[in-house]
């Protein structure tokens, strides 16, 4: 009879791994090097155990692999001899969430490692400003998020609770709209959406600037600055200037920081190159006409922030035009 000292037992270790929907992940597992390596990755739910990936007798064995893992898993075969039993997992789905056990047997020991996989998603949210008849609304929207996020609103930096929440997707991922009626307000508003699992936060900030009164054929300068508190220097962002008219938004100019490209959709619109280099995206609109009256919206957006600045421009007839009438 051989001594059982040859067979050491290592208790089950547990690790929590967080992945993102649609992305790849590595479920880690290591063991003390030995010959006769057997590896079984299994998924455990309340009722059953499913074969995710197996390796023994020197090769991957997928005959009993559950179909949901087909072509989505692999081991680092050339590293097994060095004690690496980690599983490479492709194209994560929310259904992949749960408990995975990695059994490793060698000629000298057997160990079981437990990995808890959590899957999150946080597709960049956005803040929208909408006018419906005489009412004005701010909408914080996230198209795909999991788990359910924490959404908070602030008015002039004071937390508020009155918002209308809409959610779709019963099990996840969720699509969420949080709407705030800001009719008649000239306060600044901030909406924060937090995914606690991915430790990712997005903030949308809305500011209404004082109304600008201009005469016909004059020009107007509309301010819009990128606040360094919000944006880190290497962060990609985009700037969109648009005009709100009868509840419809039409784009006037568009800037992409990654390519430094600017597109103008209105020939009378321009911005100061010098200012732009200093992260000031203030706009000039020349040769004003009466029909230019309305709301102008500057949207600076990155993965983490959206800054909305609203300008109301009132263009009045010039004296000559008025006397002509």
């Amino acid at each position: 009879i051989f001594l059982s000292a040859f067979f050491t037992y290592v208790p089950m270790n547990e690790q929590i791994i967080i992945g993102r929907l649609g992305e790849d992940i590595i479920l880690p597992s290591s063991f003390e090097r030995g010959s006769e390596v057997v590896i079984h990755w299994k998924y455990q739910d309340s009722y059953n155990s499913y074969n995710v990936h197996s390796y023994y007798k020197g090769s991957g064995r997928l005959e009993s692999q559950d179909t949901r893992y087909a072509n989505r898993t692999s081991l680092f075969y050339n590293e097994i001899q060095n004690g690496n039993a980690s599983l490479f997992f492709r194209r994560l789905s929310l259904l992949d969430e749960g408990i995975y056990t990695c059994y490793v047997g060698t000629a000298i020991q057997a160990i079981t490692n437990k990995v808890v996989l959590k899957v999150g998603v946080f597709l960049t949210p956005m803040m929208k400003y909408e006018k419906r008849n005489t009412n004005s609304f701010l909408i914080c929207n996230v198209l795909s998020v999991y788990p359910r996020p924490i959404i908070t609103w602030k008015m002039d930096n004071t937390p508020i609770s009155e918002n209308n929440m809409q959610e779709t997707g019963s099990l996840g991922p969720f699509s969420i709209n949080s709407t705030l009626n800001i009719t008649g307000s000239n306060s600044s508003y901030e909406c924060t959406i937090e995914n606690s699992l991915l430790k990712q936060t997005w903030t949308g900030r809305w500011t209404m600037k004082d109304g600008l009164h201009k005469m016909q054929s004059e020009h107007v300068s509309l301010s819009c600055e990128l606040v360094n508190d919000y944006f880190s220097p290497n962060q990609d962002f985009k700037v969109t200037w648009s005009r709100m008219e009868s509840g419809i938004s039409s784009i006037l100019a568009y800037y992409l920081s990654s390519s430094q490209n600017t597109t103008f959709y209105e020939s009378r619109f321009s911005w100061n190159k010098e200012l732009k280099n200093q992260s000031d995206f203030s706009m000039n609109l020349t040769d004003l006409s009466l029909s230019d009256s309305g709301e102008y919206l500057c949207n600076i957006s990155s993965d983490e922030y959206t800054l909305l600045t609203i300008h109301t421009v009132h263009v009045e007839p010039s004296q000559e035009t008025a006397s002509d009438n």
Partner: antibody, heavy 121, light 107 residues
């Protein structure tokens, strides 16, 4: 010290059933696959069945498939072999034997002392 | 099933002799072969796995070699304690199969 102790053998008539047990100690039972191997009197060894460490996979020799069922209770460190529709040619000493690891390797590192099953009318 | 054929069926040798037992598989089994020793009235005991790896605690006079279909078990210097029947076993695929055994007698 690794120990495997078989029990449940005896004399049984053809067509009847018998249940063999194997009690394991000296190792973490739930980490290892266990096999049944038999040996007819004066004859060679014949592999019968295997059950993997977690009970998820079971494989049988053609000669017993459909008649024998292997099972395990990891909470009690026991292995069973339910033998139905027994035939005279099933007469043998039945050994339970521990796999190198999960049950996937397929060779036998530790053996019990065996229990004799005699199928006779 | 893969057939395993051992030769010779019986072998008589003297203490100190070098003894070789051969095992042939009906198809390639790579190196997935084990050798066991069974003494009268006892359970088998693992000697060699993966064709040539010596199991822990087994005397170094035992060695194995071969791959594919041809394998050998060698006892470099026969000892009285080696009186037993020796079996090869393939574990390349289910069902696992044994050779018919080689009975080793001491002259």
């Amino acid at each position: 010290q690794v120990q495997l102790v078989e029990s449940g053998g005896g004399v049984v008539q053809p067509g009847r059933s018998l249940r063999l047990s194997c009690a394991a100690s000296g190792f973490t039972f739930s980490d290892y696959g266990i096999h049944w191997v038999r040996q007819a009197p004066g004859k060679g060894l014949e592999w019968v069945a295997v059950i993997w460490y977690d009970g998820s996979d079971k494989y049988y020799a053609d000669s017993v498939r459909g008649r024998f069922t292997i099972s395990r209770d990891n909470s009690k460190n026991t292995l069973s072999l339910q033998m139905n529709s027994l035939r005279v040619e099933d007469t043998a000493v039945y050994y339970c034997a521990r796999d190198r690891s999960s049950g996937a390797m397929g060779y036998f590192v530790y053996w019990g002392q065996g229990t004799l099953v005699t199928v006779s009318s | 099933d893969i057939q395993m054929t051992q030769s010779p069926s019986t072998l008589s040798a003297s203490v100190g002799d070098r003894v070789t037992i051969t095992c042939r598989a009906s198809q390639s089994i790579s190196s997935w072969l084990a050798w066991y020793q069974q003494k009268p009235g006892k359970a088998p005991k693992l000697l060699i796995y993966k064709a040539s790896s010596l199991e822990s605690g087994v005397p170094s006079r035992f060695s194995g070699s071969g791959s594919g279909t041809e394998f050998t078990l060698t006892i470099s210097s026969l000892q009285p304690d080696d009186l037993a029947t020796y079996y090869c076993q393939q574990y390349n695929s289910y069902s696992y199969t044994f050779g018919q055994g080689t009975k080793l007698e001491i002259k």
